[in-house]
């Protein structure tokens, strides 16, 4: 347990062993705009059944679609992709040292789960948790995009805030996005409140992911640091 | 393995109407989705629609949304293309084509494992 209570959810096992690769020899580009700063991005996706499992793809693709925008290696952005329910399962970790084209083709496996419940507070006490519990790369900014489309029982909220503000006190940045009539707009309000950087974007529905996926990823993008340059030797 | 069969294309006048079908048969009970796909000579395969097995929810390419709709009978194994307000450019050959998991993005043709064998479109002006 963690001081203060809270019950430390078991470590999810590696997907798949990891598979080293050059880092320099890097894939090139796939648009003019390419987010190269040093950033730690976690996906977390609703699994209920608020999305349909066609909605639920789109969900994915926009996934894919921001991680073609980003400059993803182990030296600038490391993503991580989390699906939750009533618990969460990890499909990439933010350590895992594999190509982006691959890490792409683990984004678009994710299952659709199709739970009664999607715990908004299961998922932030995992990425407090098991994503951030050690920070081994302080000089990144930290991001946890939140992509909510559901409400959970309010049994389930009731550390939920707690979580939030254990995220604040690591630096994790929390932007939510609420996705279409069912997103839980106090939760969003709640996790805005905590700091100004913890942006929302809220949605009618998954529809208008990919007009405002420029936008999302200009933000998250803005909010970290670029590299600083390679010092010379005297 | 799943075996799918089209039919229903044909030659028809721009502002005309056509509806495809695409019947499963074989391991139809690990289907996930049934989509339909479009390919004119010298290029690779357009997504056009899909249609989830489990929730009957569906997705279109922006080409055709609005005037194209994809519907299924569960009875029948039976997936169906109506496509209203045709156009010269639709002219194409239309494959049917399944998907036993949620792997891959659902409008790249990578992610389905069987396909029909195709049938021909054409809208002439």
């Known amino acids: 347990q963690e001081p203060g209570g809270l019950v430390v959810p078991p470590t999810d096992a590696p997907v798949s062993p990891t598979t080293l690769y050059v880092e320099d020899i890097s894939e090139p580009p796939l648009h003019d705009f390419y987010c190269s700063r040093l950033l730690d991005l976690v996906f977390l996706l609703d699994g209920s059944s608020r999305l349909s499992e066609a909605e639920f793809e789109v969900l994915k693709a926009f996934v894919v679609d921001m991680m073609e925008r980003l400059r993803i290696s182990q030296k600038w952005v490391r993503v991580a992709v989390v699906e939750y329910h009533d618990g969460s399962h990890a499909y990439i970790g933010l350590k895992d040292r594999k190509r982006p084209s691959e890490l792409r083709r683990i984004a678009s496996q994710v299952k659709y789960a199709g739970s009664q419940v999607a715990s908004t507070s299961e998922v932030l006490k995992y990425t407090l948790f098991q994503i951030f519990s050690k920070i081994d790369r302080p000089e990144a900014s930290r991001i946890a995009l939140l992509l909510m489309a559901s409400q959970e029982p309010q049994r389930m909220s009731r550390n939920f805030v707690r979580y939030v503000q254990g995220l604040k006190k690591k630096k994790v940045i929390v932007i939510p996005v609420g996705i279409g009539p069912h997103a839980n707009l106090k939760q969003i309000r709640l996790i805005e409140k905590q700091a100004p950087e913890n942006k929302a974007f809220v949605l009618s529905s998954v529809d208008e992911l990919e007009q405002q996926r420029d936008e999302i990823v200009s933000y998250l993008c803005d909010l970290a640091p670029e590299a600083p340059p390679p010092t010379l030797p005297p | 393995q799943v075996q799918l069969v089209e039919s229903g294309g044909g030659l028809v006048q721009a502002g005309g109407s056509l509806r495809l079908s695409c019947t499963a048969s074989g391991r139809t009970f690990s289907t996930y989705a049934l989509g339909w796909f479009r390919q004119v000579p010298g290029k690779g395969r357009e997504f056009i629609a899909v249609?989830?097995?489990?929730?009957?929810?569906?997705l279109y390419s922006d080409s055709v949304k609005g005037r194209f709709t994809i519907s299924k009978d569960n009875a029948k194994n039976t997936v169906y293309l109506q496509m209203n307000s045709l156009k010269p450019e639709d002219t194409a050959v239309y494959y049917c084509?399944?998907?036993?998991?949620?792997?891959?993005?659902?409008?790249?043709?990578?992610?389905?494992?069987?396909w029909g064998q195709g049938t021909q479109v054409t809208v002439s002006s």
């Open positions: 249609i989830y097995w489990r929730d009957g929810s569906s």
């Open positions: 084509a399944n998907r036993h998991d949620s792997r891959g993005t659902y409008y790249s043709s990578r992610g389905y494992d069987y």
